[in-house]
């Protein structure tokens, strides 16, 4: 129970990609405002997004401090213009979020093919090491910096003239594949964390095809 003119937030949902992490909720406020708190299981509550009429709160700065921790958030509802007002139990109305462990749950962002180079019947495909929002020593760490050996990439490739796809995997950010001489190929990559139970795969990268600017062809 809360004050008669506030309603509790509901549908609290974490939206997170490459550790950019936003808590979303409903409803759109009518004559009320929200404040969000976030905590680790063992930590103190920290308030964010004070008295906002938004229904989202960017919690990236908090979760990147330790992406392997499990976080809980809660959204408080206050009457607009009377934020001191509390519910009948002496506390403002609030709702808890699901738990969220960024390292295990953040979505992997769409990767990008940085380059490809053909030398004879071999093609080297390089995946860009995407930047995350995890900062250490005033530097943003890359996806590989954060996940290390937990991160692999899958390459899908096919002849421009056919639809049959082949796949390759790498523990690094580079693939070396065999191709048929004189054929043009198209490529797409996907980031994967095989050890995860949820959000294991990114969306596929944009397709890049030989004979376009990004690649380089060398006849040997």
């Amino acid at each position: 129970s809360g004050t008669t003119n506030t309603v509790a937030a509901y549908n609290l949902t974490w939206k997170s990609t490459n550790f950019k992490t936003i808590l979303e909720w409903e409803p759109k406020p009518v004559n009320q405002v929200y404040t969000v708190q976030i905590s680790t299981k063992s930590g103190d509550w920290k308030s964010k997004c004070f008295y906002t009429t938004d229904t989202e709160c960017d919690l990236t700065d908090e979760i990147v401090k330790d992406v392997k921790q499990t976080y809980l958030a809660r959204v408080f509802s206050y009457p607009a213009g009377n934020v001191e007002s509390t519910g009948s139990a002496g506390e403002p109305l609030y709702e808890n979020s699901p738990e969220f462990t960024p390292y295990l749950e953040t979505n992997l962002g769409q990767p990008t093919i940085q380059s490809f180079e053909q030398v004879g019947t071999k093609v080297n495909v390089t995946v860009e090491d995407e930047r995350t929002l995890v900062r250490r020593n005033n530097t943003f760490l890359s996806l590989r910096d954060v996940f290390g050996k937990d991160l692999i990439y899958t390459l899908y490739y096919w002849k421009s003239s056919s639809s049959g796809k082949k796949t390759a995997k790498t523990n690094t950010n580079e693939f070396l594949i065999d191709v048929d001489k004189g054929e043009n190929y198209c490529f797409s990559v996907q980031a994967v964390i095989p050890s995860r139970t949820v959000n294991r795969k990114s969306t596929d990268s944009p397709v890049e095809c030989m004979g376009q600017e990004k690649g380089e062809f060398r006849e040997i």
């Epitope: 910096d145 523990n171 690094t172």
Partner: nanobody, 129 residues
């Protein structure tokens, strides 16, 4: 799991130089960031330096910044620590470690960093005054 073997430790005069090497085998070496930690007698293990998987980013403890240089050669599966202008307080057992860069840097904040999954056996460095 990567197996790591350090070498290059020994006795040096204050102001002198040493070059430590760490050779890795096993899992793909070029996926890991590499770091050096050290432990002096009676003290906790402390972070010295780290280098990311590609060699493009390096990180140092304040106590060694400007004197030590970390580098790597992925073709040789080896990471190096060039120690110049050494001081008696650099005396310690130096350990090589392989992990994600995040784990190494967070280990540096939290002390020993012992949850990193691959450690060498260590090489002794002694600096005499």
């Amino acid at each position: 799991q990567v197996q790591l073997v350090e070498s290059g430790g020994g006795l040096a005069q204050a102001g002198g130089s040493l070059r430590l090497s760490c050779a890795g085998s096993g899992r793909t070496f070029s996926t890991d960031a590499m770091g050096w930690f050290r432990q002096a007698p009676g003290k906790e293990r402390e972070f010295v330096a780290a280098i990311n998987w590609s060699g493009g980013s390096t990180y140092y403890a304040d106590s060694v910044k400007g004197r030590f240089t970390i580098s790597r050669d992925n073709a040789k599966n080896t990471v190096y620590l060039q120690m110049n202008s050494v001081k008696p307080e650099d005396t310690a057992v130096y350990y090589c470690v392989a992990d994600s860069l995040l784990a190494l840097l967070d280990g540096s904040r939290g002390g020993p960093g012992t949850d990193s999954d691959s450690w060498g056996q260590g090489t002794q460095v002694t600096v005499s005054s």
